[in-house]
């Protein structure tokens, strides 16, 4: 959410988050690495175009015009410099001058060697236990952010992985309208609209870069789960990977998997929505997962078919009015899974991404909780691979990504909530190998096996 250096009274009161990079002459002497020409402190640009009428509560939500409610000045980095203080490089670049191009490769989890599989699982577990080095999370809404005494900023440290969970929760949470009033639930800054793919792309990129830094390993990349198998089994749910089913409770993960020890965050929805608090770093119960176990809903007991991916990639238009979960002939709504794989909207259909989530039948199938199950990472890297293939095939045609009148948070130039520093949907609507420093090693049905460059 915000850099630790900005989670203080002075920064919040001034509305300025421009941390020093190397303040050799004392605090405030090198905002945004300005002394070495890396960046400067500038006014935040936030989308002010109208959103659709789904959301009638303008002025009530801290996420509106993100991040202006909190900060109106932040770092603008020059050239390929990036980060909250311009201390890192843009994705795909490295070196002291951020002028050397790099490319990491995201591969099918099942194609990794035993050592690589083990390394990935260990790395996820390390991310679950490692405090995020830069970011802290707010545990109260803006009006209560300075605490009961007006002097105690309500922020907490959180682990690298739980930060990944928290950002997703914050993007989907209801709008709190006041004590005693029902919170407004028809709002979602990361789903059911054009920003679905760009938001989740940045979400994964942030986790991947956090893990690269945590491991000191610039080549570290998130693998993917090709969930389009048409099977009724989860092929990555083995104890050497994401954990098999427990013999003691069919909704839990086997104790032979490290993930059986994981505890979820952001599960106290009722508390957040009635008291107006936010999810904090407190961990609760275990991950629940029961693949293909939803006997009351046979349609979600089998994963998508390989040809579903082939078909969805033939939908040429990125999105269509009303730019929502009932859009038809929309590639975004198709891959998100509210339309049939052919692109035709059908309210009864749950396909592709949505079907994979629902198939998991547990933590991974509940929007506010889903990233708590680390399969989420693999499910979304595959979804992102499909997105990147679409961008490659259709020359990243952004013309049907609406500039205005999308659901709130989904306009093309909206800063994706709650990422920091501010990043627009447009910035993620690019082919990954050329612009973001990663590629997929993937074989699309009916095509040769390639790295997506």
């Amino acid at each position: 959410q915000f850099p630790r250096e900005c989670a203080n009274i002075e920064a919040l009161r001034r509305g300025v988050c421009c941390p020093d990079l190397l303040p050799s002459s004392g605090p405030g002497t090198d905002p945004c690495g300005s002394s070495s020409g890396r960046g400067r402190c500038v006014a935040v640009i936030a989308d002010s175009r109208p959103h659709s009428r789904h959301y009638p509560h303008d002025g009530k939500d801290d996420r509106e015009a993100w991040p202006l409610r909190f900060f109106n000045r932040t770092c603008q980095c020059n050239d390929n410099f990036s980060g909250h203080n311009c201390g890192t490089c843009r994705p795909g670049w490295r070196g002291a001058a951020c002028n050397q191009k790099i490319l990491t490769v995201r591969r099918n989890l099942l194609d990794l060697s035993p050592e690589e599989k083990s390394h990935f699982v260990r790395a996820l577990d390390m991310a679950k236990r490692t405090t995020h080095p830069q970011f802290v999370i707010a545990t109260r809404r803006l009006e209560d952010i300075l605490g009961p005494d007006g002097n105690t900023p309500q922020f907490e440290n959180i682990s690298v992985y739980n930060y990944f969970v928290w950002t997703h929760y914050y993007s989907v949470k209801k709008t709190f309208l006041g004590t005693g009033q029902e919170s407004f639930g028809d709002v979602d800054f990361s789903h059911e609209g054009p920003a679905f793919l760009t938001w989740h792309r940045y979400h994964l990129l942030q986790l991947e870069r956090d893990m690269q830094e945590m491991l000191q390993e610039p080549s570290f990349s998130l693998p993917y789960w090709n969930f389009a198998t048409g099977k009724n089994v989860c092929d990555v749910c083995t104890d050497d990977l994401m954990g098999s089913r427990s013999n003691f409770d069919s909704t839990l993960i086997s104790p032979n998997s490290v993930f059986s020890q994981w505890r979820v965050v952001c599960e106290s929805l009722e508390e957040y929505d009635t008291l107006g608090t936010l999810c904090n770093s407190t961990e609760g119960g275990p991950i629940r997962r029961n693949p293909a176990g939803n006997v009351g809903r046979p349609a979600v007991q089998r994963l998508p078919e390989p040809q579903d991916v082939t078909q969805c990639l033939e939908v040429r238009v990125f999105d269509t009015p009303p730019f929502y979960s009932n859009s038809t002939d929309s590639f975004r709504n198709t891959v998100e899974g509210y339309s049939a794989p052919t692109g035709k909207y059908d309210p009864a259909v749950r396909s592709l991404h949505n079907l994979a989530h629902l198939f998991l039948n547990g933590t991974g199938g509940q929007t506010h909780l889903s990233p708590n199950d680390p399969i989420f990472v693999l499910l979304h890297t595959f979804t992102d691979a499909v997105f990147d293939e679409w961008l490659r095939r259709y020359n990243a045609d952004i013309s049907t990504f609406p500039l205005e009148n999308a659901p709130i948070g989904h306009n093309r130039q909206y800063n994706m909530v709650p990422f920091w520093p501010p990043v627009t949907n447009t910035e993620m609507f690019v082919t990954a190998p050329d612009n973001l420093g990663y590629a997929y090693e993937v074989q699309w049905p009916g095509q040769e096996f390639t790295v997506s460059e």
Partner: antibody
Framework: EVQLQQSGAELVRPGALVKLSCKTS????????LHWVRQRPDQGLEWIGW????????VYDPKFQGTASLTADTSSNTVYLQLSGLTSEDTAVYFC??????????????WGQGTTVTVSS | DIQMSQSPASLSASVGETVTITCRAS??????LAWYQQKQGKSPHLLVY???TLADGVPSRFSGSGSGTQYSLKISSLQTEDSGNYYC?????????FGSGTKLEIK
């Protein structure tokens, strides 16, 4: 002045374990990753692993996983390498060294003097 | 794992000459490479990082170059004190393996 001062030579029996120390000065170990490297007699350098003293995270080369264990004591600015199940193949000089992660700098920039471990019955 | 193939294993040269040591990585390591010098009975000493940046205090007769999978360390105007073993090491992916070393002898 940056210094990494390693503990003295060790003579140990096969199957035993040994714990080597590396006391640092001139920098805060919480700001760096500390790596360990092995050099067998008349051989090249082998990377063992690293520890992040700020949070205790460790990563090992798979061939040292299970036999090497890295720990840190930030109050004394000291890192440790424990080796277990020693065999004559572990007879070597063990170096501690640090990595400056500023701008992802690819280098181990300061090294300890090394500790000689001899495994013999 | 990335393997580092270093060559030659040994070489002999005279004072004032120029020598080049090469390291080939089994995959692209994107300049995440360091070169070290180690004298007999001493600890390794950093010469070059990020493939081509000279470490503080290292004489300018040392230079690093290369990209992708091919890297080299050039020592011009050889001095007697340049004798010793030279190693490359990559930092692209775990584990951070070293090259096998080059023994440089000054005639």
């Amino acid at each position: 002045e940056v210094q990494l001062q390693q503990s003295g030579a060790e003579l140990v029996r096969p199957g035993a374990l040994v714990k080597l120390s590396c006391k640092t000065s001139g920098f805060n170990i919480k700001d760096y990753f500390l790596h360990w490297v092995r050099q067998r007699p008349d051989q090249g350098l082998e990377w063992i692993g690293w520890i992040n003293p700020d949070n205790g995270n460790t990563v090992y080369d798979p061939k040292f996983q299970g036999t090497a264990s890295l720990t840190a004591d930030t109050s004394s600015n000291t890192v440790y390498l424990q080796l277990s199940g020693l065999t004559s193949e572990d007879t070597a000089v063990y170096f501690c060294t640090r990595r400056d992660y500023t701008y992802e700098k690819a280098a181990l920039d300061y090294w300890g003097q090394g500790t000689t471990v001899t495994v013999s019955s | 794992d990335i393997q580092m193939s270093q060559s030659p294993a040994s070489l002999s040269a005279s004072v004032g000459e120029t020598v080049t040591i090469t390291c080939r990585a089994s995959g692209n390591i994107y300049n995440y490479l360091a070169w070290y010098q180690q004298k007999q009975g001493k600890s390794p000493h950093l010469l070059v990082y990020d493939a081509k940046t000279l470490a503080d205090g290292v004489p300018s007769r040392f230079s690093g170059s290369g990209s992708g999978t091919q890297y080299s360390l050039k020592i011009s105007s050889l001095q007697t004190e340049d004798s010793g073993n030279y190693y490359c090491q990559h930092f692209w992916s775990l584990p951070f393996t070293f090259g096998s070393g080059t023994k440089l002898e000054i005639k």
